[in-house]
Amino acid sequence: IWELKKDVYVVELDWYPDAPGEMVVLTCDTPEEDGITWTLDQSSEVLGSGKTLTIQVKEFGDAGQYTCHKGGEVLSHSLLLLHKKEDGIWSTDILKDQKEPKNKTFLRCEAKNYSGRFTCWWLTTISTDLTFSVKSSRGSSDPQGVTCGAATLSAERVRGDNKEYEYSVECQEDSACPAAEESLPIEVMVDAVHKLKYENYTSSFFIRDIIKPDPPKNLQLKPLKNSRQVEVSWEYPDTWSTPHSYFSLTFCVQVQGKSKREKKDRVFTDKTSATVICRKNASISVRAQDRYYSSSWSEWASVPCS
Amino acid sequence: RNLPVATPDPGMFPCLHHSQNLLRAVSNMLQKARQTLEFYPCTSEEIDHEDITKDKTSTVEACLPLELTKNESCLNSRETSFITNGSCLASRKTSFMMALCLSSIYEDLKMYQVEFKTMNAKLLMDPKRQIFLDQNMLAVIDELMQALNFNSETVPQKSSLEEPDFYKTKIKLCILLHAFRIRAVTIDRVMSYLNAS
């Protein structure tokens, strides 16, 4: 058993049918010695008397808010949460496996640049009685500071019969140098509590591996005289690291017909312009990627050909 | 013509071209190592990230773009940097800093070259003959060193008398390739920046 925060405790249980559970001793936070009784949650049934209460915690029915009283007055509370270990592996009931980029990906994180700022998000089908708390650091043995905000509900969507809820959090490394070569990964730890169930999720990454630039901005077409060709031009996104000659991007320019089945023409360039043939009803899209370290491509920025 | 150390402009293109080749070569070699050594811990998540140049060279610091010298996090533990003189850089200081930067890159390349050659000698003794260093990558390191045109005493290749532990050597190869790829990215960024300056 360990303390999650003041008066909230997590009991770790080897979770299998007929498991013996864990013996837990609760102590009433009071100078009083006599006439103390204990109850669980809203029930008035007295579970025991005395300054300490010994309980065998086996299932969720044994978890909850234990309260010690004296003469009708509440002395203190202890909330017991359960953390299930199923055959050597901590349970992951609360969050959805996003399966991207690989199985057992519960937290996904992205950074728009090398400033040390990043966003993580996760999915759940649970809508109520749910709380998250997020901590982060650079490295784990001698951790360096990363500050995270509060996790917020960022999207809701319907998936088949189920509603899916997306939560996200923004974090910032306290002293980040964009040009630094990372040797210690960023660690992100999310504590999730649903009703009386506690779970924790972790992700470990280098900022360089989670880079996803914003789409190029100011995408414009300039028709070339006496030609079906157009000059496409764009600019680096405002959120990208500077100077751009050091933090260079490479670009992919795509001409896409109205029908998804039509052949796509693609050009790759390090410049911020390209000459392409603009077909009728087609659209031109441009996306960006770090020129030297192949992390994710940005989303597409698009303009119609007409 | 080889790069006269102090002047960034006309001769920078060959260095930029060579540094791009270097990044391509080390990335290909790393990919090959990860595929060939699939039963070894060779992914970025599994290896310890060690930098063999740590405390010996200071490429990131010496080659820091001027625009980042205002960022205090980039100035920690820095003996050398593009120190601003008022609002602009004195040209002699620029030349001096650039020389420091390029010589630091040269020293990096020399250290990695020695490590890779030593390692290749060990890998050639492996009865499994599972993996060897790409000769193209070694050649590209050499070409960039020549383009940088520094004279420095040759470091003797490390020779080891004890029987090599091939498992450890292959893991060391992965660690080395990951670190060298990150350094090659930095070198590419620096060359691109100097080329644009």
Epitope: D14, W15, Y16, P17, D18, A19, E59, F60, K85, E86, D87, G88, I89, D93, K102, N103, K104, T125 | F39, P41, E46
Partner: antibody, heavy 115, light 112 residues
Framework: QVQLVQSGGGVVQPGRSLRLSCAAS????????MHWVRQAPGKGLEWVAF????????YYADSVKGRFTISRDNSKNTLYLQMKSLRAEDTAVYYC????????WGQGTMVTVSS | SYVLTQPPSVSGTPGQRVTISCSGG????????VKWYQQLPGTAPKLLIY???QRPSGVPDRFSGSKSGTSASLAITGVQAEDEADYYC????????????FGTGTKVTVLG
């Protein structure tokens, strides 16, 4: 006393369907994940499927994906395996088992797919 | 396709020490716990070892398990006639959990 009692096995022709049941008692069935495991005659153990305690997630072996469906009725304390498009290679003893460091197995039920 | 490899058979005379190996990889045994089962002919498997080296109550102490790196082993010290059975190791793969990964199985024969 934890008990898993299986039923529903038998002889079936290729291409036909069969549903296996596993009735649980002696524990809070709705709190635990459950597996199906099979063993072809003279062969080793092969995992077939898993279902979470609340039925929210189901996992299948590639060999049965799209043909077998694992389900549970927590109000009846029963686990099911619906098998469709059966093949000769599905012939095996099928076991249900609880998920956890200590596990309990059903007695097994024989499924024979033969024309 | 079995990813956990066991020897097809091992044998010993009563009182001898018999060991069965179970070889896997970094993503299974290397990152997860191992169980061992005993299966007597015509019966369901019985748990012998859980969490690499733990014995459930009721399992004789002549059975012991261990794990090192990407391999595990089961030892029977002082093998007895009633130990003649099939033995299976089981683990998980970190990418496919909760799918059970079984070993190929080992037939233990007690001679004489």
């Amino acid at each position: 006393q934890v008990q898993l009692v299986q039923s529903g096995g038998g002889v079936v022709q290729p291409g036909r369907s069969l549903r296996l049941s596993c009735a649980a008692s002696g524990f809070t069935f709705s709190s635990y994940g459950m597996h199906w495991v099979r063993q072809a005659p003279g062969k080793g153990l092969e995992w077939v499927a898993f279902i979470r305690y609340d039925g929210s997630n189901k996992y299948y072996a590639d060999s049965v994906k799209g043909r077998f469906t694992i389900s549970r009725d927590n109000s009846k304390n029963t686990l099911y395996l619906q098998m469709k498009s059966l093949r000769a290679e599905d012939t095996a003893v099928y076991y249900c088992k609880t998920h956890g460091s200590h596990d309990n197995w059903g007695q097994g039920t024989m499924v024979t797919v033969s024309s | 396709s079995y990813v956990l490899t066991q020897p097809p058979s091992v044998s010993g005379t009563p009182g001898q020490r018999v060991t069965i190996s179970c070889s896997g990889g970094r993503s299974n045994i290397g990152s997860n716990t191992v169980k061992w089962y005993q299966q007597l002919p015509g019966t369901a498997p019985k748990l012998l070892i859980y969490t690499n080296d733990q014995r459930p109550s009721g399992v004789p102490d002549r059975f012991s398990g261990s794990k090192s790196g990407t391999s595990a082993s089961l030892a029977i010290t002082g093998v007895q006639a009633e130990d003649e059975a099939d033995y299976y190791c089981q683990s998980y793969d970190r990418g496919t959990h909760p799918a059970l990964l079984f070993g190929t199985g080992t037939k233990v024969t007690v001679l004489g």
